[in-house]
C-alpha cells in the first residue's frame, strides 16, 4: 500500500481501538459539480433493458433514502419495440458504502456498512451452462 | 421524516456542532451475503453495451480503490455482433458516499464526500433535440 | 445423482388451490434458472413459469398469470407452484424443468426434467 | 404469439429409414428452436438447441437445420429407442417457450 506522511495537525485518538473508530465530518463536500442529472434521468425509460426505480427508506441508515433499479422485463427491447427473450435484461449492481446507526437510534454513532444496489439494467446474451 | 427515540446507551457527544462530526466504526458489516460475484462479473463483456473497467485510486479516500466504467463503443453491438450506431451505449452513473481524509493524510478524522461513478453501461435509442 | 423430483399433485376441485414442490439434488441449485412445465392428458406442452437465480426475475403464461405464484429455496434446494383458483383446465401433469442458462439467467430451454406430479381439477 | 406447426403429425419409418421433421413458426424466431423428444410415461429429453446445436450426450445421427421460419430435425437412421414424439420449442418472443403440436414418430 501506499504510506501517507502523518499530518502535524491531526486530531488525537482516545480510542485504545484506533483507528477502528474514527471522527466523520457529515457536511457532504459534493463533488460533482459538472454534471447534470438531466442526461441520464431518463435513461430508466429509454434503455433497451428498461428499469423501474423503487424507494428504499431506513431511518437507521444514512443515507436513509436509496433507490433501487428493478428491471422491467426479462427480455430486452427489440428495434421493432417488442421484447427478445432470447436475451436477458438484467441488473447492474455495484457495492456502496452506509453509515448504520449503532447503538440502534443513536444520532451520532454510526458503524461502516456494505450495501449490493441494483444501479440500473443491461441486456445481456445469456450463455449455455456446460456441465462438466 | 421519521422521528426516532434516542437509544439512552448512546455515546455523548462533545462537539458543539454535533452533530455535523460523528463517530464511526471501520469493522464494516457486510449485508451482501446472499450474493454470488460470479454471477455479475461478466456482464461487462456479455452486455450489448459492454464496458471496461478502470482503476481509480485515491489514498485520501476511503475505500481508496473505486472501479470505474467506460463504455466501449459509442452504439451498442446487434444481432451480428456488429456496432449499431443507431443505439448509444450510455454509462449509468451513481452517486456514492466515500471518505475523504481531513486534514489531509490524517489516519482517524473524515469528511463525508458525495463523488459520482459509472458502474456500467446501458444501450438506449436516441432521442431528438427539438429546438423551440 | 443429478435429478427433480415433483410432488404435491393430486384431487383438487375448481376454485380451490394446491402447491407444488420439486426438490433438487445433484447440482447447484442456485445456479440454474427454473421453470414449471405442463401437458394435459394426450395432450402437447406447455410452459407455466419461469425464475431466475435469484427470484429477481418471474414470468408466467398467460394463461395462469395472477392465479399461480412460482417461488425458490435456494438454501433447501427446492422449486415451488402455489396454484390458487385452479380451473378444469389446468388439469395436466406438471414438470420441474432446469433451463440451460449458465449463471442462473434464462435461456428458455430445458436441459434437465423430472418425471411430473399430476394435478386433476375436478368436482 | 408466435404459433409452431410441426409437420406431420405422424412419420410411419421402420428402423433403419431416415425421419425428416418438420417445425414451421408463424413468425421469425432466427435460429432461436430446440427440439425435444419424449417417450411413453417420461419426462421429455432435450436433443437440439438454437437449431442445430446438439445438447450434450445426444447421438450424432441427430441433426438440426434451419433459420427464420422452417426447421428441420433428421434422424440420420432411425434407431429402435428413436420411436417417440418430438416436439420443437421457441424461445425468441413471448411467451418464450411456445412448443408445438408435436410429430410422433411410429414403427411402420
Known amino acids: 500500500g501506499i504510506t501517507i506522511p502523518r499530518n502535524p495537525g491531526c486530531p488525537n485518538s482516545e480510542d485504545k481501538n484506533f483507528p477502528r473508530t474514527v471522527m466523520v465530518n457529515l457536511n457532504i463536500h459534493n463533488r460533482n459539480t459538472n454534471t447534470n442529472p438531466k442526461r441520464s434521468s431518463d435513461y430508466y425509460n429509454r434503455s433497451t433493458s428498461p428499469w423501474n426505480l423503487h424507494r428504499n427508506e431506513d431511518p437507521e441508515r444514512y443515507p436513509s433514502v436509496i433507490w433501487e433499479a428493478k428491471c422491467r422485463h426479462l427480455g430486452c427491447i427489440n428495434a421493432d419495440g417488442n421484447v427478445d427473450y432470447h436475451m436477458n435484461s438484467v441488473p447492474i449492481q455495484q457495492e456502496i458504502l452506509v453509515l448504520r446507526r449503532e447503538p440502534p437510534h443513536c444520532p451520532n454513532s454510526f458503524r461502516l456498512e456494505k450495501i449490493l444496489v441494483s444501479v440500473g439494467c443491461t441486456c445481456v446474451t445469456p450463455i449455455v451452462h456446460h456441465v462438466a | 421524516g421519521i422521528t426516532i427515540p434516542r437509544n439512552p446507551g448512546c455515546p455523548n457527544s462533545e462537539d458543539k456542532n454535533f452533530p455535523r462530526t460523528v463517530m464511526v466504526n471501520l469493522n464494516i458489516h457486510n449485508r451482501n451475503t446472499n450474493t454470488n460475484p460470479k454471477r455479475s462479473s461478466d456482464y461487462y463483456n456479455r452486455s450489448t453495451s459492454p464496458w471496461n473497467l478502470h482503476r481509480n485510486e485515491d489514498p485520501e479516500r476511503y475505500p481508496s480503490v473505486i472501479w470505474e466504467a467506460k463504455c466501449r463503443h459509442l452504439g451498442c453491438i446487434n444481432a451480428d455482433g456488429n456496432v449499431d450506431y443507431h443505439m448509444n451505449s450510455v454509462p449509468i452513473q451513481q452517486e456514492i458516499l466515500v471518505l475523504r481524509r481531513e486534514p489531509p493524510h490524517c489516519p482517524n478524522s473524515f469528511r463525508l464526500e458525495k463523488i459520482l461513478v459509472s458502474v456500467g453501461c446501458t444501450c438506449v435509442t436516441p432521442i431528438v433535440h427539438h429546438v423551440a | 445423482e443429478v435429478q427433480l423430483v415433483e410432488s404435491g399433485g393430486g384431487l383438487v376441485q375448481p376454485g380451490r388451490s394446491l402447491r407444488l414442490s420439486c426438490a433438487a439434488s445433484?447440482?447447484?441449485?442456485?445456479?440454474?434458472?427454473m421453470h414449471w412445465v405442463r401437458q394435459a392428458p394426450g395432450k402437447g406442452l406447455e410452459w407455466v413459469s419461469g425464475?431466475?437465480?435469484?427470484?429477481?426475475?418471474?414470468g408466467y403464461a398467460d394463461s395462469v398469470k395472477g392465479r399461480f405464484t412460482i417461488s425458490r429455496d435456494n438454501a433447501k434446494n427446492s422449486l415451488y407452484l402455489q396454484m390458487n383458483s385452479l380451473r378444469a383446465e389446468d388439469t395436466a401433469l406438471y414438470y420441474c424443468?432446469?433451463?440451460?442458462?449458465?449463471?442462473?439467467?434464462?435461456?428458455?430451454?430445458?436441459?434437465?426434467w423430472g418425471r411430473g406430479t399430476l394435478v386433476t381439477v375436478s368436482s | 404469439e408466435i404459433v409452431l406447426t410441426q409437420s406431420p403429425a405422424t412419420l410411419s419409418l421402420s428402423p433403419g429409414e431416415r425421419a425428416t421433421l418438420s417445425c414451421r413458426a408463424s413468425?421469425?424466431?432466427?435460429?432461436?428452436l430446440a427440439w425435444y423428444q419424449q417417450k411413453p410415461g417420461q419426462a421429455p429429453r432435450l436433443l437440439i438447441y438454437?437449431?442445430?446445436n446438439r445438447a450434450t450426450g445426444i447421438p450424432a445421427r441427430f441433426s438440426g437445420s434451419g433459420s427464420g421460419t422452417d426447421f428441420t430435425l433428421t434422424i440420420s437412421s432411425l434407431e429402435p429407442e428413436d420411436f417417440a414424439v418430438y416436439y420443437c420449442?421457441?424461445?425468441?418472443?413471448?411467451?418464450?417457450?411456445?412448443f408445438g403440436g408435436g410429430t410422433k414418430v411410429e414403427i411402420k
Open positions: 438454437d437449431a442445430s
Open positions: 445433484g447440482f447447484t441449485f442456485d445456479d440454474y434458472a
Open positions: 420449442q421457441q424461445r425468441s418472443n413471448w411467451p418464450p417457450a411456445t
Open positions: 413468425q421469425s424466431v432466427r435460429s432461436y
Open positions: 425464475i431466475n437465480w435469484n427470484s429477481g426475475g418471474i
Open positions: 424443468a432446469r433451463d440451460m442458462g449458465g449463471f442462473g439467467e434464462f435461456y428458455w430451454n430445458f436441459g434437465l
